[in-house]
């Protein structure tokens, strides 16, 4: 796995652990929580930084569903199980052998169940809405300056092929990121959306996962874009199965 | 040439916590993971647990978390394995080794837990 | 955790013979395999890193093989009687790292 073999750190996680004894004595970075080797030359699964995050909580988050089969993490943190390439595992139980089915980016797709649930296959998330709400500024920011920068930011930052930003939309003060990916369009080595969904909200929440990088300065034409709300909806290639008493609350 | 030091042997009475020690020289202390094995007579190795030196990051097998605590001293690029409350089931050969494949060995500490 | 499984639990050859061990994962580990000799009373010593890089100061003899799942494989090309020791295979895939049961070698 590469790293910076200079002084062995991985740019792209800081919660890492990095020792010169990889393979050939070569610098080799392992996620904490897991231990797990990480490609330090793109970003890591969201499910490997949950799992590193947890071995030093930090205050859980919650949000809040908008419609009928988007999905956002109302769950908050928790001590995922990862598979042997780092992605969720479908089911996902915690220590009191309760259990539940999640998508692609860890978020549940189904009520709790106990131990006897069973998840037959990790179902693709491949859709996401990054809604964010902007702080007040002297005029509406241009759309295609925006667009652009925020193209360039997921294209650069993040390492995201272009072809999976679908589309940027502006409303003052309100701005859509729309991120699509199908199961068909993501080749080997692509970064997931689902990834740099993740790597963004940690940037935004100035909790940048990147090691030694400033915090993300997001500037539209020399004007900075300060946001204050960020809300991230979630579409799977296969609907949630909720029971009616949980669409209904 | 790079060395891990252990002393020998070590006797302790039951329920006595006892801490073994791990000299390093040869290398970069903080730079490398020390592991922590065991070995009783007769029998395979049992990986306890790692620590990383440089910020005394840890890892436990699930099987010594309540029984062992791996610390380090930088300043003498020493690695310390702590049992809490020894029985005879403790009773082992304890061996400290660097990296993930671990390529340098201390000789180990026979630890006997004996009234 | 990883389980590996080593075996057979005794391997009995004559001087001269090529011989192998085995070690299997409970799941992909890729190369993330390495291998041990202990000779009685000695302390392990690395004998393969990483399923096949060859250490330094190990005779050429030794050798290894394999990835994934499947059989890894430890290779002794000519077996002789200072080879008399105990095998181990260990992974440093993830944590908690374990090791096979080991197997030992017995020369006639």
């Known amino acids: 796995h590469t790293a910076a073999q200079d002084n062995c750190t991985c740019p792209t996680n800081k919660m890492t652990v990095c020792s010169p004894d990889g393979p050939g004595g070569r610098c080799q970075c392992r996620a904490l929580g897991s231990g797990m080797a990480v490609d330090c030359s793109t970003l890591t699964s969201k499910c490997l930084l949950l799992k590193a995050r947890m071995s030093a909580p930090k205050n859980a988050r919650t949000l809040v569903r908008p419609s009928e089969h988007a999905l956002v993490d109302n769950d908050g943190l928790y001590d995922p199980d990862c598979d042997p390439e780092g992605r969720f595992k479908a089911r996902q139980c915690n220590q009191t052998s309760v259990c539940w089915c999640v998508n692609s980016v860890g978020v549940r797709r189904t009520d709790k169940g106990d131990l006897s649930l069973r998840c037959d296959e990790l179902v693709r998330t491949h859709h996401i809405l990054i809604d964010l709400r902007h702080r007040p500024t002297a005029g509406a920011f241009n759309h295609s300056d925006l667009d652009a920068e925020l193209r360039r930011l997921f294209r650069e930052r993040y390492r995201l092929h272009p072809k999976f930003v679908a589309a940027v939309h502006y409303e003052q003060p309100t701005i859509q990121i729309e991120l699509r990916q199908n199961t068909s369009q993501k080749a080997a080595g692509d970064v997931d959306i689902g990834d740099a969904a993740y790597y963004f909200e940690r940037d935004i929440k100035g909790e940048s996962l990147f090691q030694g990088r400033g915090g993300l300065d997001l500037r539209v034409r020399g004007e900075p874009l300060q946001v204050e709300r960020t809300l991230i909806y979630y579409l799977d290639e296969i609907p949630p199965k909720f029971s009616m008493k949980r669409l209904t609350a | 040439q790079v060395q891990l030091q252990q002393p020998g042997a070590e006797l302790v009475r039951p329920g006595a916590s006892v801490r073994l020690s791990c000299k390093s020289s040869g290398y970069t202390f903080t730079s490398y993971w020390i592991n922590w094995v065991k070995q009783r007579p007769g029998q395979g190795l049992e990986w306890i647990g790692n620590?990383?030196?440089?910020?005394?990051?840890?890892n436990y097998n699930q099987k010594f978390r309540d029984k062992a605590t791996l610390t380090v001293d930088k300043s003498s690029s020493t690695a310390y394995l702590q049992l809490s409350s020894p029985t005879s089931d403790d009773s082992a050969v304890y061996y400290c080794t660097r990296g993930s494949g671990f390529d340098y060995w201390g000789q180990g500490t026979a630890l006997t837990v004996s009234s | 955790d990883i389980l590996l499984t080593q075996s057979p639990a005794i391997l009995s050859v004559s001087p001269g013979e090529r011989v192998s061990f085995s070690c299997r994962a409970s799941q992909n580990i890729g190369t993330s395999i390495h291998w041990y000799q202990q000779r009685t009373n000695g302390s392990p010593r690395l004998l393969i890193s990483?399923?096949?890089?060859s250490i330094s100061g190990i005779p050429s003899r030794f050798s290894g093989s394999g990835s994934g799942t499947d059989f890894t494989l430890l290779i002794i090309n000519s077996v002789e009687s200072e080879d008399i020791a105990d095998y181990y295979c260990?992974?440093?895939?993830?944590?908690?790292?374990?090791f096979g049961s080991g197997t030992k070698l017995e020369v006639k």
């Open positions: 990483y399923a096949s890089e």
């Open positions: 620590i990383f030196p440089s910020h005394s990051y840890t």
């Open positions: 260990q992974h440093s895939y993830s944590w908690p790292f374990t």
